[in-house]
Amino acid sequence: MMTGTIETTGNISAEKGGSIILQCHLSSTTAQVTQVNWEQQDQLLAICNADLGWHISPSFKDRVAPGPGLGLTLQSLTVNDTGEYFCIYHTYPDGTYTGRIFLEVLESSVAEHGARFQIP
C-alpha cells in the first residue's frame, strides 16, 4: 500500500580515478520489485530487471559494473561524475519509488590535502 521507503548511501565522496558503490534499499513494503533503473540526471546508466537481469547502457559499459545486489559500481571516476544519481524502483502493486544519492568526485590532491591538514 505504498508504505515503502528507500534508504540510500546519501551524500558520498570519492577520489578521481577511484571507484564507488551506489546502493539503495527498499523496505517496509510487500510490493514485488520488477525493475530497478539507475539514472544520472536524465541519463540511464543501468537496469536491473527481475526477469531479464542486468543491462548497462553502452556509453557506460567500460566504467559501470552491476552490483553488489541491486546496487551499482562506478569505476575510473572523473570530476564530471559529480552529481545526483537516482535509483528508481518499479514495483507491483505500489508503482515507483525513487531514491537519491549525491556523489562528489574530488581531485586526488584535494582529497590528500584535506587528509593531511585535518584540524584535530
Epitope: 514485488q32 526477469d51 515507483t96
Partner: antibody, heavy 123, light 107 residues
Framework: QLQLQESGPGLVKPSETLSLTCTVS??????????WGWIRQPPGKGLEWIGS???????FYNPSFKSRVTISVDTSKNQFSLKLSSVTAADTAVYYC???????????????WGQGTLVTVSS | DIQMTQSPSTLSASVGDRVTITCRAS??????LAWYQQKPGKAPKLLIY???SLESGVPSRFSGSGSGTEFTLTISSLQPDDFATYYC?????????FGGGTKVEIK
C-alpha cells in the same frame, strides 16, 4: 494517443480455454513505467481484475483465477495475452485490457482501456 | 480480499443536481481509492485517484473525498453527459477490487 485493442474468439465452449490478445498502439509495451492488465465484466455486473503483467514477463494474478489464468507478453508485437482455462458459463463477460500507470507516488491505476470484447461460454 | 460496497446502487437525479455516491471498504485502504465512470457499451474512464486527485481532463464538477474505509464521489452540478455508472476501486492491496457500481439515471 495510446490505444488498446482486444481480439479473440467471441464464443468458447465449456471446459475449453479462452484466449485473448491485446494489441497496444501509440506507445511501447516495453516501457518500464507501465504494467498491463486484464479486467472482466459479466453482463450487467461489476468489474473484476484478473491479473497484470510487466513487459519483462513478471505476472500478478487475482487468486480467484490463479489456477486457471496465464498472462503473457510479446514485446516484438507490442501485445499481451490472456488465457483462461476450464471455462464455464460463469466466465461469460466483456473482457477488457488496460494499462496500469502511476501518478507520481500514488500507486498504479488503470488509465487507458481497450473497448472490450464479449466472450460467451456456451456449447 | 477487500470488499468494496457502493451506495446507492441506483440514483435518480436531474440536470443541475448535486449528486453524492458513497463507497465503503471492508478494511482500511488509506487513500488508495479511484473512481471510474462507465457509459453503456464503453470502457470505464478514470476520474479520480488517491481518493481526491482529479485525473487530467476531467471536469472540476467531479470531486472525491475520504480516507480509511469511507469515501465519496460528488458531482456538484449534474450535466447530461454525467448519466452513467460509477465504480470505485481500491488499489492499495492485491487483489485490486471494485465496487458494485452506482447507476446515475435521469429522474
Amino acid at each position: 494517443q495510446l490505444q488498446l485493442q482486444e481480439s479473440g474468439p467471441g464464443l468458447v465452449k465449456p471446459s475449453e480455454t479462452l484466449s485473448l490478445t491485446c494489441t497496444v498502439s501509440g506507445g511501447s509495451i516495453s516501457s518500464s513505467l507501465y504494467y498491463w492488465g486484464w479486467i472482466r465484466q459479466p453482463p450487467g455486473k461489476g468489474l473484476e481484475w484478473i491479473g497484470s503483467i510487466y513487459y519483462s514477463g513478471s505476472t500478478f494474478y487475482n487468486p480467484s483465477f490463479k489456477s486457471r489464468v496465464t498472462i503473457s507478453v510479446d514485446t516484438s508485437k507490442n501485445q499481451f495475452s490472456l488465457k483462461l482455462s476450464s471455462v464455464t458459463a460463469a466466465d461469460t463477460a466483456v473482457y477488457y485490457c488496460a494499462r496500469e500507470a502511476g501518478r507520481g507516488t500514488t500507486g498504479l491505476l488503470f488509465d487507458y482501456w481497450g473497448q472490450g470484447t464479449l466472450v460467451t461460454v456456451s456449447s | 480480499d477487500i470488499q468494496m460496497t457502493q451506495s446507492p446502487s441506483t440514483l435518480s437525479a436531474s440536470v443541475g443536481d448535486r449528486v453524492t455516491i458513497t463507497c465503503r471498504a471492508s478494511q482500511s485502504i488509506s487513500s488508495w481509492l479511484a473512481w471510474y465512470q462507465q457509459k453503456p457499451g464503453k470502457a470505464p474512464k478514470l476520474l479520480i485517484y488517491k481518493a481526491s486527485s482529479l485525473e487530467s481532463g476531467v471536469p472540476s464538477r467531479f470531486s472525491g473525498s475520504g480516507s480509511g474505509t469511507e469515501f465519496t464521489l460528488t458531482i456538484s452540478s449534474l450535466q447530461p453527459d454525467d448519466f452513467a455508472t460509477y465504480y470505485c476501486q481500491q488499489y492499495g492491496i492485491l487483489p485490486r477490487t471494485f465496487g458494485g457500481g452506482t447507476k446515475v439515471e435521469i429522474k
